[in-house]
């Protein structure tokens, strides 16, 4: 049993340069920005702006790029190695409980409460009771954690420990 390969384990000629259309799989896997051919012999580049892959993989197809919905703005475009990043338009936010849609931020706090946090693309305004200081809305969701355990960084396929 052994850990899975990282990009550094690959011989330089096996590392797919961004401009390459095809390269050879390493131990049956293709690097981010590529997918494997049906016969398993080649790594084929994803199509910029159409599809992508963020991890080492043996996908037969790259993943389709997300299209931002109306009510969203495109923060960064889809590349061959990264999906589109969409963000709610100003004055709206995306709740953890309903990540599929942007909701309008409240315009003000209920009576007896004071605003301590502004509307952001990921949270509604935050209100606290004037006297006690206890919150009325939920906590602002934490920024997504960049865990280095599986499934690894885009540059290297981490392992499930065997």
């Amino acid at each position: 049993e052994s850990a899975l390969i990282t990009q550094q384990d690959l011989a330089p000629q096996q590392r797919a340069a961004p401009q390459q259309k095809r390269s050879s799989p390493s131990e049956g896997l293709c690097p981010p920005g590529h997918h494997i051919s049906e016969d398993g012999r080649d790594c084929i580049s994803c199509k910029y702006g159409q599809d992508y892959s963020t991890h080492w993989n043996d996908l037969l197809f790259c993943l389709r790029c997300t299209r931002c919905d109306s009510g969203e703005v495109e923060l960064s475009p889809c590349t061959t190695t990264r999906n589109t990043v969409c963000q709610c338009e100003e004055g709206t936010f995306r709740e953890e409980d309903s990540p599929e849609m942007c909701r309008k931020c409240r315009t003000g706090c209920p009576r007896g409460m004071v605003k301590v946090g502004d509307c952001t693309p990921w949270s509604d305004i935050e209100c606290v009771h004037k006297e006690s200081g206890t919150k009325h809305s939920g906590e602002v969701p934490a920024v997504e954690e960049t865990v280095t355990s599986s499934p690894g960084t885009p540059a290297s396929p981490c392992s499930l420990s065997g």
Partner: antibody, heavy 121, light 111 residues
Framework: EVQLVESGGGLVQPGGSLRLSCAAS????????MSWVRQAPGKGLEWVAA????????HYPDTVKGRFTISRDNAKNSLYLQMNSLRAEDTAVYYC??????????????WGQGTLVTVSS | DIVLTQSPDSLAVSLGERATINCRAS??????????MHWYQQKPGQPPKLLIY???NLESGVPDRFSGSGSRTDFTLTISSLQAEDVAVYYC?????????FGGGTKVEIK
Amino acid sequence: EVQLVESGGGLVQPGGSLRLSCAASGLPFNSYYMSWVRQAPGKGLEWVAAINSNGGRIHYPDTVKGRFTISRDNAKNSLYLQMNSLRAEDTAVYYCTRLTYYGNPAWFAYWGQGTLVTVSS
Amino acid sequence: DIVLTQSPDSLAVSLGERATINCRASESVDIYGNSFMHWYQQKPGQPPKLLIYLSSNLESGVPDRFSGSGSRTDFTLTISSLQAEDVAVYYCQQSYEDPLTFGGGTKVEIK
């Protein structure tokens, strides 16, 4: 069309051994991760073992580690599961699967029909 | 281990109506914009079949009445218009962390 055909199941006594085989066709077998998943009668699914394309990287959950061994013969397009020190709780249908890799062994794209292993005295 | 809790355990829906199955993970299964959650269908006497991978990607050949959504810890499989052939048990599965784990399953029946 991808076909995965399991064999080798049967009745075995507790503490005994059994070797399951899976014959694959319709895919470039030597390019893909393969795996075994089991399902106890009337119960849910449990992943049992995974192996990469050349057999050099192997993964098990703690429930079977040290007792089960996954292996493959790419020349024969075959996957194997050697099961030792079998227990009553290993009784299940064992499925051979083609495991898609995406940053990790990820999802089970194709499944065989399964072979039943019964551990009982 | 990441524990996946499916709800409800069983669900009876009229033909043509919407069926919604939930799967909650004991911790986030998101990283780098991907949700490492997948869905399977298992009809009586058959092996499971992949429906959805990475939360929302429809497997080739799967009818588009099936859809997946969700992120971090909360995921949903939706059948927009239930057909007789959709009677089955549905399982979620995560691949964020070792070991790969499945939810306990949700049985979908016709009302």
